[in-house]
């Protein structure tokens, strides 16, 4: 009696179970009464990453330098190429099909996490006691100057965008 289900790494066709092709190979002929499934290796710049019955291999992803992309990991017959972004850029999506410049943190915000090839800069507002007076993709919020340690007094309070201004203490007469 013909099978209705097949073992792992097999598929059902013409009432018989045929072996799937291993990763890195494509199907060229289903099994028959007289022969096993026939598979051929994927060509240069092609891959298949699973046990399969695909008649065509997938093309490796192209890391287009015009889109700011570069190869992070070269593809094999069993894996796709992994792209990442050039320095100063990050991917716009998980599949990394294009790149955009890293975001700068505006004055009043500091860098919480520096951007990578796959993630943008994460900014955070400068809390009380800290400030950032520049637009930067690298600078963290800096602490206000401690006037006391310099034997000075605060002449102008700091904000999230400006440091405190220190000045000499009033002399007692």
């Amino acid at each position: 009696e013909p099978p209705t289900a097949c073992r792992e790494k097999q598929y059902l066709i013409n009432s018989q179970c045929c072996s799937l092709c291993q990763p890195g190979q494509k199907l060229v002929s289903d099994c028959t009464e007289f022969t096993e499934t026939e598979c051929l290796p994927c060509g240069e710049s092609e891959f298949l990453d699973t046990w399969n019955r695909e008649t065509r291999c997938h093309q490796h992803k192209y890391c287009d330098p015009n889109l700011g992309l570069r190869v992070q990991q070269k593809g094999t017959s069993e894996t796709d190429t992994i792209c990442t972004c050039e320095e100063g850029l990050h991917c716009t999506s998980e599949s990394c099909e294009s790149c955009v410049p890293h975001r700068s943190c505006l004055p009043g915000f500091g860098v919480k996490q520096i951007a990578t090839g796959v993630s943008d800069t994460i900014c955070e507002p400068c809390p009380v006691g800290f400030f950032s007076n520049v637009s930067s993709a690298f600078e963290k919020c800096r602490p206000w100057t401690s006037c006391e340690t310099k034997d000075l007094v605060v002449q102008q309070a700091g904000t999230n965008k400006t440091d405190v201004v220190c000045g000499p203490q009033d002399r007692q007469r």
């Epitope: 072996s19 060229v28 028959t32 007289f34 022969t35 096993e36 499934t37 026939e38």
Partner: antibody, heavy 114, light 112 residues
């Protein structure tokens, strides 16, 4: 029913290219492979190669540098070319449908001689 | 490439006798799927080979039950239980487990 018929010149000069055609009926070239097999007079059988449904090919390593198999799906024809032939290539050439090993062509004798 | 060695080269027997033909492979013909793709063909002068047995022991449709195949791994046998006059011919084993497909050199069964 499945049928295969080989055709081509019966005589080829040494160093020339042998060209044969296999015309098939009863099965579809876009979904099935075709093999070429040969048999020198009074000797055993030798697998030459196969063209698969999608046009990919496998060749016997001993002949790979000289053999080309191609096809024309619209004409139901498969072609064998064997270059730089010598007397050792004198044989009956058969074509065979993949999965139809019970049905061989009648074979065509090719003699390599000047 | 897998080499198939058939023995004997020639078998001289009388009709009604039992014929035992051997085919030995240079390496295992068991595919990773567990199947073994070993065929037997019969060929008469001026004719194309005729499929008798496939996958070691399966008789092809229309083949008389006096023909049987057996064996495993690297050693295979074709048995003709009682030779009929039409059985005198050359017999080839063939493997389609591994590319390139290969054939044995043949065993001739002739009338004694």
């Amino acid at each position: 029913q499945v049928q295969l018929q080989e055709s081509g010149p019966g005589l080829v000069k040494p160093s020339e290219t042998l060209s044969l055609t296999c015309t098939v009926s009863g099965f579809s070239l876009p979904t099935s492979g075709v093999h070429w097999i040969r048999q020198p007079p009074g000797k055993g059988l030798e697998w030459i190669g196969v063209i698969w449904a999608g046009g990919d090919t496998n060749y016997n390593p001993s002949l790979k540098s000289r053999v080309t198999i191609s096809k024309d799906n619209s004409k139901n024809q498969v072609f064998l070319k064997l270059s730089s032939v010598t007397a050792a290539d004198t044989a009956v050439y058969y074509c065979l449908g993949h999965g139809h090993f019970d049905v061989w062509g009648q074979g065509t004798l090719v003699t390599v001689s000047s | 490439e897998i080499v198939l060695t058939q023995s004997p080269g020639t078998l001289s027997l009388s009709p009604g006798e039992r014929a035992t033909l051997s085919c030995r492979s240079s390496q295992s013909l068991v595919h990773s799927s567990g199947n073994t793709y070993l065929q037997w063909y019969q060929q008469k002068p001026g004719q194309a080979p005729r499929l008798l047995i496939y996958k070691v022991s399966n008789r092809f449709s229309g083949i008389p039950d006096r023909f049987s195949g057996s064996g495993s791994g690297t050693d295979f046998t074709l048995t003709i239980s009682r030779l009929e006059p039409e059985d005198f011919a050359v017999y080839y084993c063939s493997q389609t487990t591994h590319v390139p497909w290969t054939f044995g050199q043949g065993t001739k069964v002739e009338i004694k």
